[in-house]
Interface confidence: medium
């Protein structure tokens, strides 16, 4: 059986939309499937790699690599999207390419960044972990770390940094899929909202879905002990 909830929820474009949340109900009138997984049910994607989920994560990563920061022209906010999802008339799509990206490093200007921009994250403005010396962030945003400390300044002069961020990674469903969404949408969908991250590649949704002890390697499920828990 399914339980359907419909509600007006604030979406990425800053407008309220009618959204449906479909929850698979437990046939035996008990905890939901997500709760059962958290409690240690034998859910194979938490025990070993699931090809389907792996493909989904890789697909999401490929899309994210090509994303940019969509900044609303009315200064209402910005969100990480694909170019096709960013209005050409109402917004500015900040995407580095050819010669528009900043240099990879201050000491060598020949190498320009082509991956990015990312809303509210920039290697030039992050102090921890700083992109410098031996630890220069790669030219692939899906390999960027979470910036835990931004340089203290109200304005950077960069469009993708001086905007109000409207969406962050949200882990939705037992498949561990990730979307950049508003907090409202994420909570309505019973997802896990990552306030600390800017990109889906920075979070490990399956790890969150499975709960219990975190995976040793966030990308590799290893909860074999589930076989004895349930």
């Amino acid at each position: 059986a399914q339980h359907v909830t419909t509600q007006l929820v604030l979406r990425n474009k800053g407008v309220y939309e009618s959204v449906k949340y479909i929850q698979q109900e437990n046939f035996w009138i008990g905890p939901s499937s997500i709760d059962l997984i958290h409690l240690g049910a034998k859910f194979s994607p938490c025990i070993r790699k699931d090809q389907q989920i792996e493909q989904l994560v890789l697909r999401e990563r490929d899309l994210e690599r090509d994303s940019g920061c969509c900044v609303q022209n009315d200064h209402s906010g910005c969100i990480q999207t694909q170019r096709k999802d960013c209005s050409e008339t109402l917004a500015t799509f900040v995407k580095w390419q050819d010669d528009t990206g900043p240099p990879m490093d201050k000491s060598d200007l020949g190498q320009k960044r082509t991956s990015g921009a990312v809303c509210h994250q920039d290697p030039r403005t992050c102090e921890e972990p700083a992109s410098s010396g031996a630890h220069i962030w790669p030219d692939d945003i899906t390999k960027w770390p979470i910036c835990t400390e931004q340089a203290k300044s109200n304005r950077t002069g960069f469009l993708h940094m001086d905007c109000q961020i409207k969406g962050r990674p949200c882990c939705i469903s037992t498949k561990g899929s990730c979307e950049i969404t508003t907090r409202e949408y994420c909570e309505f969908m019973h997802g896990y909202f990552h306030e600390e991250a800017t990109l889906c590649s920075q979070v490990h949704c399956l790890d969150k879905v499975c709960g219990l002890l975190p995976f040793l390697n966030p990308e590799v499920p290893d909860q074999f002990y589930r076989l004895w828990l349930s």
């Epitope: 240099p103 200007l109 403005t125 410098s132 340089a151 203290k152 950077t156 002069g157 960069f158």
Partner: antibody, heavy 122, light 107 residues
């Protein structure tokens, strides 16, 4: 309006440490993408880049002089400092500071100070 | 380090004349080159950056161009205040390096 002004001891003796100050206005080193560099010019010779400090405190030095150079900044006072240890006659020169800008494009050394003359003599 | 070979080392020219100075980079600098003017009193002013972009307030008679690893500064019609020393500067890589300079004298 961006201005930079260098100051130094004028004269000092061999083996001493040269301390130079660059005081600037019209910009702040707490602003992303800005930096200040030091350059010198010995009499009748060309220009030689010495060191650079960026808004995020990242520092670069001329490898040929690195062991003797120390660059630092006081963001609140709008000042950048350069120390050159163990000076000798070859360090006699006019020392300039200049602003640099690092962003999408890179506008190197766009504003220069007037220079300060330093003589190393016993 | 990147070597910048500047020529000529000195140049005598008359008012109204067109002159051209050249810098050659020993390695690829991708257009990260500026031209500086140093007046007899020691003051230094940047004229051009990114090989050909004129700084604001610089007269249009100055122009910069690039051909491969050769970078040129041209002054279309010399005026009295143009007689000075000129240096090229590469800023593609640290350490920044300068050309040896061209002394432009009045004939």
């Amino acid at each position: 309006q961006v201005t930079l002004k260098e100051s130094g001891p004028g004269i000092l003796q061999p083996s001493q440490t040269l301390s130079l100050t660059c005081s600037f206005s019209g910009f702040s080193l707490s602003t992303f993408s800005l930096g200040v560099g030091w350059i010198r010019q010995s009499s009748g010779k060309g220009l030689e880049w010495l060191a650079h400090i960026w808004w995020d405190d990242e520092k670069y030095y001329n490898p040929a002089l690195k062991s003797r150079l120390t660059i630092s900044k006081d963001t609140s006072k709008n000042q950048v400092f350069l120390k050159i240890a163990n000076v000798d006659a070859a360090d006699t020169a006019t020392y300039y500071c200049a602003r640099a800008y690092y962003s999408k494009s890179y506008y190197a050394l766009d504003y220069w100070g007037q220079g300060t003359s330093v003589t190393v003599s016993s | 380090d990147i070597q910048m070979t500047q020529s000529p080392s000195s140049l005598s020219a008359s008012l109204g004349e067109r002159v051209s100075l050249t810098c050659r980079a020993s390695q690829e600098i991708s257009g990260y080159l500026s031209w500086l003017q140093q007046k007899p009193d020691g003051t230094i002013k940047r004229l051009i950056y990114a090989a050909s972009t004129l700084d604001s307030g610089v007269p249009k008679r100055f122009s910069g161009s690039r051909s491969g690893s050769d970078y040129s500064l041209a002054i279309s019609s010399l005026e009295s205040e143009d007689f000075a020393d000129y240096y090229c500067l590469q800023y593609a890589n640290f350490p920044f390096t300068f050309g040896s300079g061209t002394k432009l004298e009045i004939k």
